[in-house]
Interface confidence: medium
């Protein structure tokens, strides 16, 4: 649902769900490609594996990934790239059971950060070919402009 | 980053990251000392192991701690002390694997609470000498005035 | 605490804690009955096992459940029922240790969603007779109107 702003005082929001997840052959990471499920305001733009910040400011960011993987620890890193540098904002880490039938954990984290115009926000799983569940209610990413 | 308020309608926010963590000898707790990473508004003040509320109101509070400990369960308790009593607001609990290489879990929780002027907010890990990872993107504490 | 609104610009909020949790005999689910711990505004109404949305809009929803259960995976599903259909908004999943003394995990998740007038929000644990800890700082549910 894309909502129009009735008044300036409303918060811009963006809630994204996965399209797919891929690993580059030469990289020990898995990236998620996102699509909007809910958008209010125009300050944020989904762009493939990232989200572009068009309206600088202070945002509440949240991220959840649902893992189905027996790798001993799994998790995601939320980072921003802009002004020529990359910065990790927050990460979530979950120890996983070694038995495949039990290896099922969601990992949620969130925080408030100042984002700059032109920043690209992304969610990275620092594992090649990570086994994720891309259900929209298990894996998602969100922004609220404060 | 310390931000100035362009207009009164903006939310006061404070995002804190660790300086260090210590345990008192006579108590089975570990406390975290905090420093601001992002601040907007003046209603919240980091004070060593606590955060003083200078502007009463309803706040979204969030807390994450990154544990590297084989103690069977780990977690943090977020509480407020004020008006002569202490109150637990919320807690996060995580069972930990017994193998040190796997014992790596972040624990995130959050909620909305009414805080009073003069309240001191703190994050307690009810374990002495808890093994924490004090990376600013793994362990943090935050407030948003609603 | 029920707070009055000093001005229209304040966010409506509702933070709920458990009264009890029950399983219907013929159903493989456990439901939680909620009571308000903090309320500001009139747009949300606790109704037994659900929360009725009286004021449509975009909300930050959060949910935590504290599990004390050796069932291999535990978790909660937050869903809305309205306009003749049910929709899962988000879920939290946690693998549990098989030893009862270690089987202790909180599961937190949250997200931003558009809720319609008349929607009923509920938290379901898709396990019959799930062993939950109903401490108000371990299991809770919350809403912030954005």
């Amino acid at each position: 649902a894309v909502l129009t702003q009735k008044q300036k005082k409303q918060h811009s929001v963006l809630h994204l769900v996965p399209i797919n997840a891929t690993s580059k052959d030469d990289s020990d990471v898995t990236e998620v490609m996102w699509q909007p499920a809910l958008r209010r305001g125009r300050g944020l733009q989904a762009q493939g594996y990232g989200v572009r910040i068009q309206d600088a400011g202070v945002y509440l960011l949240y991220s959840q990934v649902l893992f189905q993987d027996v790798t001993f620890t799994m998790g995601q890193v939320v980072s921003r790239e802009g002004q020529g540098r990359q910065e990790t904002l927050f990460r979530c880490i979950r120890s996983m059971p070694s038995h495949p039938d039990r290896a099922y954990n969601s990992c949620y984290s969130a925080g408030v950060f100042h984002l700059h115009q032109g920043d690209i926000l992304s969610v990275i799983i620092p594992r090649a070919r990570a086994k994720l569940n891309l259900s929209p209610h298990g894996t998602f990413l969100g922004f609220v402009k404060l | 980053a310390v931000l100035t308020q362009k207009q009164k309608k903006q939310h006061s926010v404070l995002h804190l990251v660790p300086i260090n963590a210590t345990s008192k000898d006579d108590s089975d707790v570990t406390e975290v000392m905090w420093q601001p990473a992002l601040r907007r508004g003046r209603g919240l003040q980091a004070q060593g192991y606590g955060v003083r509320i200078q502007d009463a109101g309803v706040y979204l509070l969030y807390s994450q701690v990154l544990f590297q400990d084989v103690t069977f369960t780990m977690g943090q308790v977020v509480s407020r002390e004020g008006q002569g009593r202490q109150e637990t607001l919320f807690r996060c609990i995580r069972s930990m694997p017994s193998h040190p290489d796997r014992a790596y879990n972040s624990c995130y929780s959050a909620g909305v609470f009414h805080l009073h002027q003069g309240d001191i907010l703190s994050v307690i890990i009810p374990r002495a000498r808890a093994k924490l990872n004090l990376s600013p993107h793994g362990t943090f504490l935050g407030f948003v005035k609603l | 605490a029920v707070l009055t609104q000093k001005q229209k610009k304040q966010h409506s909020v509702l933070h709920l804690v458990p009264i009890n949790a029950t399983s219907k005999d013929d159903s493989d689910v456990t439901e939680v009955m909620w009571q308000p711990a903090l309320r500001r505004g009139r747009g949300l109404q606790a109704q037994g096992y659900g929360v009725r949305i009286q004021d449509a809009g975009v909300y930050l929803l959060y949910s935590q459940v504290l599990f004390q259960d050796v069932t291999f995976t535990m978790g909660q599903v937050v869903s809305r029922e309205g306009q003749g259909r049910q929709e899962t908004l988000f879920r939290c999943i946690r693998s549990m240790p098989s030893h009862p003394d270690r089987a202790y995990n909180s599961c937190y998740s949250a997200g931003v969603f558009h809720l319609h007038q008349g929607d009923i929000l509920s938290v379901i644990i898709p396990r019959a007779r799930a062993k939950l800890n109903l401490s108000p700082h371990g299991t809770f549910l919350g809403f912030v109107k954005l």
């Epitope: - | 108590s27 089975d28 069977f72 009810p126 374990r127 002495a128 000498r129 | 003394d101 401490s135 371990g138």
Partner: antibody, heavy 121, light 107 residues
Framework: QVQLVQSGAEVKKPGASVKVSCKAS????????MHWVRQAPGQGLEWMGY????????KYNEKFKGRVTMTRDTSISTAYMELSRLRSDDTAVYYC??????????????WGQGTTVTVSS | DIVMTQSPSTLSASVGDRVTITCKAS??????VAWYQQKPGKAPKLLIS???NRDSGVPSRFSGSGSGTEFTLTISSLQPDDFATYFC?????????FGQGTKLEIK
């Protein structure tokens, strides 16, 4: 099977100290906290605190802070509770009790047989 | 400190009776309440934890219920071995506190 065996009865004078021991067997000593609870004659139960054998860290009831010391010796799976500056109203049966795990949110599932401490001049 | 108020203080009943003991907490303690049975000269024995979970080996005639501030221990059909003193305890907030006890005696 889990057993907690406490030391024998003690008679002490006011102002003295008493140290009660509690030997655990049948489980991994460092995986559970050990609570201490006392019961004055004909009265109810009063929680004094606990020792976490995993990290040798105590948690005391504020009422007893400064007078109580809880310790442990993991090599012999034994917990100790020492109460100083004894008064006549400290006359009670002192119990050790195993905490079911993480101290908060867990009940006390196994109890020692109790140690009678009598404070009399 | 949280006050746990038990009632009644004394209860007279007969074998086969159904009896109920209540415990009220001075503030919300979730379901972090235990019930113990104590016989004269003996240590307390855990019956119920988490308000309603029977400990292993405890007969099914013992049941617990409640959450928040009001809790109940019910013995569905009294047996001769059940005449004892019963204590509730909250373990939600330090310091842990006990009720003053209910003495169950033969009528």
């Amino acid at each position: 099977q889990v057993q907690l065996v406490q030391s024998g009865a003690e008679v002490k004078k006011p102002g003295a100290s008493v140290k009660v021991s509690c030997k655990a067997s049948g489980y991994t000593f460092t995986s559970y906290v050990m609570h201490w609870v006392r019961q004055a004659p004909g009265q109810g139960l009063e929680w004094m605190g606990y020792i976490n054998p995993y990290n040798d860290a105590p948690k005391y009831n504020e009422k007893f802070k400064g007078r109580v010391t809880m310790t442990r010796d993991t090599s012999i799976s034994t917990a100790y509770m020492e109460l100083s500056r004894l008064r006549s109203d400290d006359t009670a049966v002192y119990y050790c009790a195993r905490g079911l795990g993480y101290a908060l949110y867990y009940a006390m599932d196994y109890w020692g047989q109790g140690t009678t401490v009598t404070v009399s001049s | 400190d949280i006050v746990m108020t038990q009632s009644p203080s004394t209860l007279s009943a007969s074998v086969g009776d159904r009896v109920t003991i209540t415990c009220k907490a001075s503030q919300n303690v979730g379901n972090n309440v235990a019930w113990y049975q104590q016989k004269p000269g003996k240590a307390p024995k855990l019956l119920i934890s988490s308000a309603s979970n029977r400990d292993s080996g405890v007969p099914s005639r013992f049941s617990g219920s409640g959450s928040g501030t009001e809790f109940t221990l019910t013995i569905s059909s009294l047996q001769p071995d059940d005449f004892a003193t019963y204590f509730c305890q909250q373990y939600n907030i330090y310091p842990f506190t006990f009720g003053q006890g209910t003495k169950l005696e033969i009528k």
